[in-house]
Structures are given as C-alpha cells and as structure tokens.
C-alpha cells in the first residue's frame, strides 16, 4: 500500500494542502489512454512536486507524469484497465498524499462536435445533430448525451434533454417565435465506465421563424 | 496484513433480522469498497450488494432490495449488513470481501453462518 | 442477470496433469480487451481465495500453473500441473453488470 496507519483509521490524516483529482481519457490518441490530474487549490507552489501512478498497469510497476503548466499529465497504452490504481503527490522520494483509483471511473469523455440545427417547415420542428469521437471507440462507446438550449435573452434559462442517440427533434411550438436560440451539447459515460461530463461543444445558434397571422403557424427563416 | 473480521453465528426465527458487523484492517479503508456474498449449504455463491465506505452509497442486488441495508462506520473501519424478514431459505453462510476493483474479491472474512430456523 | 455455465460440474486429475475448466456466460462480459471475468478457488470449511482477474491477470501471491484465459462469452481457467492441494470448487464470476454472478462452480478432485 501507501504507508497508511495499518489500523485504516487514519484516511484522513493526508494533508490537506495537497488534496488533487484526476480524470482519464480512453483512446484518446488512437490506442493510447491520458490520466490528467491537478491540484484542487490553485496557489499549490508547484514547483518541486511529481505525481506517481502505480498498480493496474502492464508491464510496469509504476509510471511518472509529465508536468504542464498547473496540469500533470501521462499519455500511454500501458492502462490495465481493471483494479485500483495509486496515485501520489511525491516530493523527491516522499509521498505526500495518495489515491487510491479506478480509472474506468473517472472517465471524461471527449467534447461532442459539429452540433448543428435544421428547420423542417413541413414538419414544424428542429432537427438537432451532432457527432462524438467515441462513436468510433472501442471502450467508451455509451454515451448519455445533455443537449441544452436557451434563448440568448435568457442568460441562465437553460433546457436540458438528456438523450443516448447523436439526433434529437425539438418541436417548434415548444420553443418562442422570432426568438435567437443558443444550443450546446456535452456527453457522460454510460454503460460500465463511469465518470464526469466532457467540456461542452461549441455552441450553435440558431433563430426560430415568425409566427404566420393568417394560419398562426410560424414563418421558415 | 489485510484482514476483515466478521462477528459471529447467528440463530434467527422467521421474520427476523440480522446485523453481520465485518470490521476491515491493514489498509486504508476508505480506499476499497466492501461486498457481501452469501452461500447456501452446499451451494454456490451469490452477491447481494455492496458498499462505498467513503461515501457511503450502496448497490444492492434486486432480488434482495427492500430487505437488505448496507451501512459503515469509519470510525471503527467496520461495516454492517442487515437483513430483514428472514426465512429458512437465507440460511447460509455471509461474506463480507473487498473489492480489489469493479467488481472481484480479493480479500475475504472469514463467514458468518446465518441460521434461519423455528 | 448474466447467467454463467461452468463445466465440467466435477473433474478427477492425476497429480502433474492439467486441468480445464470452461466458463461460458449468456452475454459478453467483454468490452474490447477488458474482459470482465474472475477466478476463485474454495476449500471446504473456507472463504473463497481470488486466483484470476480480468480473465487473465493472476493475482498476487497465486502460483503460475494457474492461468486463464478467454474472451467475450467463452473463459477457460486452467491448472498445469496440478498438485494435491489444488482439491478444492473453483468459480467464475463476471463483473460486466449488476447483479454481479458466479457460475455453479466446479469440484476438482486429485486422484
């Protein structure tokens, strides 16, 4: 293990000033896999601090970060993928604070892309579309998808719909006439892995059409 | 050395309940969930659930839900299993074992036997 | 709930022969080459011991001549050679979903 009091009672007693999380990324460079990890407090003087992951790996006992910024960072195929990894904050050869981690449980997945929204004036509705690397994953390839919309004069009214396919149809009558709309789109694992939300994708904006006075249906753009 | 030790056997009526205490050492032990699996007599191995004692939260086995509560105390590195509305057929001996990740067992207690009798 | 089917339900071994043991689930406990399958062994009156994770990795402390193998629905665990103290039912168990299932277990005797 890690030097813990053998009695287990001492979980607490890492110091506090180092406490720091970790998500991993699975192919996310072809085969190979990325564990980023950070400090919680960002006025951690970084300077002569390391970050050590040992256990779950293949071939190796241990593997070392790469320092970037305020950001440590390993890229590697040598992920086991099953069973707890430990994760240490080293000065030199001491151990300041361990975790102990599954990777498949601190998946972040990557942003979903070229989200866009097409008008169907026959239908009276949106077509929302968008696409995801991880389609083309072998790992994490289940995705719960959270497509949110406001409408830009609203700065904190999002909607959000939670949805497992990349389409999504919104009906015009839900939505407000003549009005500009802002639609993003972000993806959590699903199935097995577990993990955070990936970053959102960029934002598409969009405007409904005006509504018709004669039949009260809305005007295509 | 990694230990989990679990308190001792129990007679029980129909209609009852069971608390098995299974109190872990030699690691840290916030770091490893804790399961439960039980065994019939001279049969297989079934999991009824399992516990995060770093956050406390549970999943349990449907065929067991409504009956079974799994609960830990840090301070005591020990955790509890109780089950509720027993019957001959939860005659059986309790594990408690660790999960070394999602979802094997690599340290085990030593078994509870659970007699459900009238 | 993954039903796992192990056979044989019972072998006889001479000591320094192999022994196999098959394991086959009703769905993939596999995702890519994380295969989510695990090995015990249990002598009477004991806990269960873990042998093998992840369907191959063996686990600290567990001689070599244990090892398995497989992938997707079909997972073999095999002993070469076998010595009288390997007497004891061996049990597959997946990981993939919950609820969490062992097969039925296979009792090894040594001639």
């Known amino acids: 293990e890690s030097g813990y009091a053998q009695n287990g009672d001492l979980e607490d007693a890492e110091l506090d000033d180092y406490s720091f999380s970790c998500y991993s990324q699975l192919e996310v460079n072809g085969s190979q896999h990325s564990l980023t990890c950070a400090f919680e407090d960002p006025d951690v003087n970084i300077t002569n601090l390391e970050f050590e992951i040992c256990g779950a790996l293949v071939e190796v006992k241990c593997l070392n970060f790469r320092k970037l910024q305020e950001i440590y960072f390993i890229e590697t195929k040598k992920f086991l993928l099953i069973g707890k990894s430990n994760i240490c904050v080293k000065v030199g050869e001491k151990s300041l604070t361990c975790k102990k981690i599954d990777l498949t449980t601190i998946v972040k997945p990557e942003a979903p892309f070229d989200l866009s929204v097409v008008y169907r004036e026959g239908a009276n509705d949106f077509v929302v579309t968008f696409n995801t690397s991880h389609l083309q994953k072998k790992y994490v390839k289940v995705l719960m998808h959270d497509v949110a919309y406001r409408q830009e004069k609203d700065e904190n009214k999002w909607t959000h719909v939670n949805l497992s396919s990349t389409k999504l149809t919104l009906l015009q009558r839900k939505l407000q006439p003549a009005a500009m709309y802002e639609i993003k789109v972000r993806s959590i694992p699903d199935h097995y892995f577990k993990g955070f939300w990936s970053e959102w994708s960029p934002s598409y904006y969009f405007r409904t059409p005006e509504i018709n006075n004669s039949s009260g249906e809305m005007d295509p753009i | 050395q990694v230990q989990l030790v679990q308190s001792g056997a129990e007679v029980k009526k129909p209609g009852a309940s069971v608390k098995v205490s299974c109190k872990a050492s030699g690691y840290r032990f916030t770091d490893y969930e804790l399961h439960w699996v039980r065994q019939a007599p001279g049969q297989g191995l079934e999991w009824m659930g399992g516990?995060?004692?770093?956050?406390?939260?549970?999943a349990y086995n449907q065929k067991f839900k409504g009956r079974v509560t799994m609960t830990s105390d840090r301070s005591t590195s020990t955790v509890y299993m109780e089950l509720s509305s027993l019957r001959s057929e939860d005659t059986a001996v309790y594990y408690c074992?660790?999960?070394?990740?999602?979802?094997?067992?690599?340290?085990w207690g030593q078994g509870t036997t659970v007699t459900v009798s009238s | 709930d993954i039903v796992l089917t192990q056979s044989p339900a019972s072998l006889a071994v001479s000591p320094g022969q192999r022994a196999t043991i098959t394991c086959r689930t009703s769905?993939?406990?596999?995702?890519?080459?994380?295969?989510?399958m695990h090995w015990y062994q249990q002598k009477p009156g004991q806990p269960p011991k873990l042998l093998i994770y992840g369907a191959s990795n063996l686990e600290s402390g567990v001689p070599a001549r244990f090892s398995g193998s497989g992938s997707g629905t079909d997972f073999t665990l095999t002993i070469n050679p076998v010595e009288a103290e390997d007497t004891a039912n061996y049990y597959c168990q997946q990981s993939i979903k919950d609820p969490y299932t062992f097969g039925g277990g296979t009792k090894v005797e040594i001639k």
């Open positions: 074992a660790r999960s070394g990740g999602r979802w094997y067992f690599d340290v």
């Open positions: 516990i995060d004692p770093k956050t406390g939260g549970t």
């Open positions: 769905e993939s406990v596999s995702i890519h080459l994380l295969h989510l």
